[in-house]
Amino acid sequence: GDMLIQKTIKKEVVLEEGTIAFKNWVKTGTEIYRQFWIFDVQNPQEVMMNSSNIQVKQRGPYTYRVRFLAKENITQDPKDNTVSFLQPNGAIFEPSLSVGTEADNFTVLNLAVAAASHIYPNPFVQVVLNSLINKSKSSMFQVRTLRELLWGYTDPFLSLVPYPVSTRVGMFYPYNNTADGVYKVFNGKDSISKVAIIDTYKGKRNLSYWESYCDMINGTDAASFPPFVEKSQVLQFFSSDICRSIYAVFESDVNLKGIPVYRFVLPSKAFASPVQNPDNHCFCTEKIISKNCTSYGVLDISKCKEGKPVYISLPHFLYASPDVSETIDGLNPNEEEHRTYLDIEPITGFTLQFAKRLQVNLLVKPSNKIQVLKRLKRNYIVPILWLNETGTIGDEKAKMFRSQVTGKIN
């Protein structure tokens, strides 16, 4: 009975040629979609001239099929029972699942202007940058197509910079034809309790972005977890999108296409300030924007983005402190729509359904040397877009799962 099932599970979840887990791990059988909502700025002039609140209107979804490419450079290392790989990036636009086309226009923050003024606070450099910003007729805001905003465009201001800088800018530039990794994960051969847990990322056990334990690469990549998941567990996983490890806790039992799964959610505690949750002290990297580490719900990942002032949050600043969103009008945080969850089949540890939601924001600060930022009287963490990456086990796979796994248990 149970012993036989345990033995079978232990055999089949190992990440090596010939197992059920390996086949699905190399190339996911689940269709994964990434939906984007863009925050279209309604009052760019008032913000720039009067430092008004930014009025945004979300437009979306614009949907892309993602993670359809098989893992590359898969290399087993029998010495330490690990398997290493690259996860190639690719995105295909899905017009039928979108409200418009990739040519739709949006008024958004000028990414290059906001980033350059942050990266180069030196007044002399800012005066130089200001002359180039003016010469290129750039402003605090810009109009860009969806394709440009997401995947990249040649910035007119950066094109005038007479130094070796990348002139291409985009929220996810570069993306297609790139890969995430190298990941090196335990294959579970020596200990099934370690299967899929990341040993190293990009050749290191740490990220070099954070102080202390915040810098650790913990858990799996969230696509699966070691088998025999308990409701009491705190599931750790690493997300390269947010440049950190994070965790999920059990919320409820869910029936997914006849398969009993555990719904694990990212708790608000994970986004709390160090005042509320001292464990988060090492995710607070500066004192001014964070109001001496009392702000919560936003994560400064500039160190992971070549110094660009990128802040990650949940969509619509869900679970964020009021000071973060007080400069933005038009946001409606909603737990059901905007939180992240993982539906995990507890016997195998496989994530059969998930919704990963996050928002990408950019900090823009007043600068008395950059004309287009001169009239600002306060800092803004400006929402650019939010995304919902989802995957659900297909009907055929679910049927197979019911007969092979849950059916046998019941």
Epitope: Y120, N122, P123, F124, V125, V127, V128, N130, S131, N134, Y163, N368, K369, Q371, K374
Partner: antibody, heavy 119, light 107 residues
Framework: EVQLVESGGGVVQPGESLKLSCESN????????MSWVRKTPERRLELVAA????????YYPDTMERRFIISRDNTKKTLYLQMSSLKSEDTAMYYC????????????WGQGTLVTVSA | ETTVTQSPASLSMAIGEKVTIRCITS??????MNWYQQKPGEPPKLLIS???TLRPGVPSRFSSSGYGTDFVFTIENMLSEDVADYYC?????????FGAGTKLELK
């Protein structure tokens, strides 16, 4: 006290080149932006070139026509101005100036070195 | 390009008198105006930097005011040691531009 000492000035003919140097006594020289400013015989002050602390970013007014190149060697605590294709209107007293801590332009000046371009 | 118009070109004042020099800019430069003094045979010296800020060690008889396009530099009680050329400099935008200078002499 900040000390900046310029050298390299002299009398040259039109079309010739000259390299000016400015030596600093400051330990913190590598953390300061620097400029060259000139004073013409008509008593006009003009910015010639500027460079940021690590030498990565330079600025030249369009009027300088890219005939001048500013550079620095932080290990030697020295600022340079390479001048080529000199014209009679380049005749001036050339000062090196250090920017202030908070970005103030030309907070401290050297004594200057005289460049005379004459046939 | 922001042009800076400085006036007067020269000024002859008696000791103890109040000296006023004016600079007008062609564009709004907020308070990014600086004032320099150059005595004969010496390099220029920064007296007042952006934001009408008196530099450390500069006597309090020197002051400045102004915002936007109109700026005034004042010496409250002129001393003989104040005989010099005075220049304003706008540091708001490139190219940085100096005023043409004011020659202050003793009456």
């Amino acid at each position: 006290e900040v000390q900046l000492v310029e050298s390299g000035g002299g009398v040259v003919q039109p079309g010739e080149s000259l390299k000016l140097s400015c030596e600093s006594n400051e330990y913190e020289f590598p953390s300061h932006d620097m400029s060259w400013v000139r004073k013409t015989p008509e008593r006009r002050l003009e910015l010639v070139a500027a460079i940021n602390s690590d030498g990565a970013i330079t600025y030249y007014p369009d009027t300088m026509e890219r005939r001048f190149i500013i550079s620095r060697d932080n290990t030697k605590k020295t600022l340079y101005l390479q001048m080529s294709s000199l014209k009679s209107e380049d005749t001036a007293m050339y000062y090196c100036a250090r920017h202030g801590q908070t970005g103030t332009w030309f907070a401290y000046w050297g004594q200057g070195t005289l460049v005379t371009v004459s046939a | 390009e922001t042009t800076v118009t400085q006036s007067p070109a020269s000024l002859s004042m008696a000791i103890g008198e109040k000296v006023t020099i004016r600079c007008i800019t062609s564009t709004d430069i907020d308070d990014d105006m600086n004032w320099y003094q150059q005595k004969p045979g010496e390099p220029p010296k920064l007296l007042i930097s952006e934001g009408n800020t008196l530099r450390p060690g500069v006597p309090s008889r020197f002051s400045s005011s102004g915002y936007g396009t109109d700026f005034v530099f004042t010496i409250e009680n002129m001393l003989s040691e104040d005989v010099a050329d005075y220049y304003c400099l706008q540091s708001d935008n490139l190219p940085l531009t100096f005023g043409a200078g004011t020659k202050l002499e003793l009456k």
